[in-house]
């Protein structure tokens, strides 16, 4: 009588997840009696995964009709497979008894399951910087199998080059995860500016997933700020101009001393935006030469995205009765930096 | 249709010998382990002899050395030669299918009576 | 020889009753166990197999339940065409045994 052989064809199989794996077997022998059991794992742990003599398993059915006597083939059918499923099944047959004796497995067959990775979500970082400053923006994605992957950094369509990544676990697993992080110098220019993290498994058919981060999260352009005086009208009031430009976010709070004192306070909002993203803003501020006695100094304080405000000065000269004065004059930068005035975005 | 037919059953004398047949259609008899079960009259089931898809064969200790279990995979059917018979294998005989993979019995045949007195 | 030992040997119910007939082996069995119905002048019919699987065409009314030693038939809705003998069976090693049998009686 020739041995009972437990025929298992395939080595590995591999599977989208979401898609049906099927698990072959046959043997060459349907003698002894008893029932053909199937496993993933092998040895004392090992989990039942279909029994053809009983047990209710509903993602499981045979391939062929287990209720036909001359049928040798048990093959099974795994539906909606996912991650968890990964693992090597045995197809193993029982002489029938109490309890059946085990007497012989099949070789084993892998079943690996392709899982696409989740779209990829970038983050940047918890506080704005300044241009030439580095900031540092992390890509996560997850639940993918198998663990090889590729994943690339662009800003606007350069591909970055300074970036460190990581897939873990290092061993072997159902699934993996991907987190990387992209460290990018800011400049200027950079409010419209997008980094895009770029992630290709061969779940994705050559068409690779995109996460994107825009740089106008990351960044702070600080204002430049120039005070000017137009010419003295009619009526002794001289006109101040206190030009901000460049500035982004918007989120800006203007204050006008004179001599010192609070005269104004305005808050920037719905501004019209320049080319490159960033703000301007003009505020003007008549001052009445003829109720001062003294040189009136006048300073522009901008406190820009809660940032230690920024002053520029200019004085007024009250003895020169300049009611001739045809041409703005600019102020000077003070460069003081007075304490912080927290005001609303506009 | 799946079905099972006995024949083969009468009067016989103690001492002598009856051969009893099973006719099985709509099913491939030599591939299902297959018995027989009798049934004294106003008694329980008793199962008598088996015999596997090997032709390996299998007897309840009273019949050992006088009964023997065959089939006949050209005919699809099985036998059940009965010699030496006594009063005590008076019975209705059932030629039973042993089910798929752990041989449970699923299918019977209607039966046919043995009756051994002199 | 394993033994079955079913009990009770009869019983009487009525219609709409639920009743259940034990079966003890001498020895476990794992779930090879059957149980089988038969009418007068009948050939049984095959009811359970590995001790809860319902062969096809049994009404859902009859369950089997237990694995070793000890196993149970359930009817859970009597109607008049259940009043019959009932058998249990090992069918674990040769030589396959029956119980004695239960004969169900209407009340």
């Known amino acids: 009588e020739e041995e009972l052989q437990v025929i298992q064809p395939e080595k590995s199989v591999s599977v989208a997840a979401g898609d049906s794996a099927t698990l072959n077997c046959t043997v060459s022998s349907l003698i002894p009696v008893g029932p053909i059991q199937w496993f993933r794992g092998a040895g004392p742990g090992r989990e039942l995964i279909y029994n053809l003599k009983e047990g209710h398993f509903p993602r499981v059915t045979p391939v062929s009709d287990p209720t036909k006597r001359n049928n040798m083939d048990f093959s099974i059918r795994i539906s909606n497979i996912t991650p968890a499923d990964a693992g090597t099944y045995y197809c193993v047959k029982f002489r029938k008894g109490s309890p059946d004796v085990e007497l012989k497995s099949g070789a084993g067959t892998e079943l690996s399951v392709r899982a696409k990775p989740s779209a990829p979500v970038v983050s940047g970082p918890a506080v704005r910087a300044t241009a030439e400053h580095t900031v540092s923006f992390t890509c996560e994605s997850h639940g993918f199998s198998p663990r090889d992957i590729t994943l690339k950094w662009f800003k606007n369509g350069n591909e970055l080059s300074d970036f460190q990544t990581n897939v873990d676990p290092a061993g072997k697993s159902v699934s993996y995860s991907i987190r990387s992080t992209a460290r990018v110098v800011l400049t200027r220019r950079d409010v419209h500016s997008q980094v895009i993290c770029e992630v290709a498994h061969v779940t994705l058919q050559g068409d690779p997933l995109r996460g994107t981060a825009n740089l106008s999260e990351a960044i702070r352009v600080p204002p430049f700020l120039e005070v000017t005086q137009q010419s003295m009208r009619a009526d002794n009031q001289v006109n101040v101009t206190c030009q901000v430009t460049k500035f982004y976010p918007q989120r800006l709070q203007l204050t006008w001393l004179e001599n010192g004192n609070v005269s104004r306070t305005e808050m920037a909002s719905a501004l019209p935006e320049n080319k490159d993203g960033t703000y301007n803003w003009t505020s003007w501020l008549l001052v009445n030469v003829s109720a001062h006695r003294d040189d009136v100094k006048l300073t522009c304080q901008v406190e820009h995205d809660g940032q230690p405000a920024v002053n520029k000065s200019f004085s007024v000269k009250v003895s020169a009765h300049p009611k001739e004065q045809g041409s703005n004059t600019a102020a000077e930068n003070t460069g003081t930096n007075e304490r912080n005035i927290y005001g609303g975005s506009g | 249709e799946v079905q099972l037919v006995e024949s083969g059953g009468g009067l016989v004398q103690p001492g002598g010998s009856l051969r009893l047949s099973c006719a099985a259609s709509?099913?491939?008899?030599?591939?299902?382990?297959m018995h027989w079960v009798r049934q004294a009259p106003g008694k329980g089931l008793e199962w008598v002899s088996a015999i596997g898809t090997a032709g390996d064969t299998y007897y309840t200790g009273s019949v050992k050395g006088r009964f023997t279990i065959s089939r006949e995979n050209a005919k699809n059917s099985l036998y059940l030669q009965m010699n030496s018979l006594r009063a005590d294998d008076t019975a209705v005989y059932y030629c039973v299918r042993g089910g798929v993979w752990d041989d449970a019995f699923d299918i019977w045949g209607q039966g046919t009576m043995v009756t051994v007195s002199s | 020889d394993i033994q079955m030992t079913q009990s009770p040997s009869s019983l009487s119910a009525s219609v709409g009753d639920r009743v259940t007939i034990t079966c003890r082996a001498s020895q476990g069995i794992n779930n090879y166990a059957a149980w089988f119905q038969q009418k007068p002048g009948k050939a049984p019919k095959s009811l359970i197999y590995t001790a809860s699987s319902l062969h096809s065409g049994v009404p859902s009314k009859f369950s089997g339940s237990g694995s070793g030693t000890d196993f149970t038939l359930t009817i859970s809705s009597l109607q008049p065409e259940d009043f019959a003998t009932y058998y249990c069976?090992?069918?674990?090693?040769?030589?396959?045994?029956f119980g004695q049998g239960t004969k169900l009686e209407i009340k």
């Open positions: 709509g099913f491939t008899l030599s591939s299902y382990d």
């Open positions: 069976q090992q069918y674990v090693s040769y030589p396959y045994t």
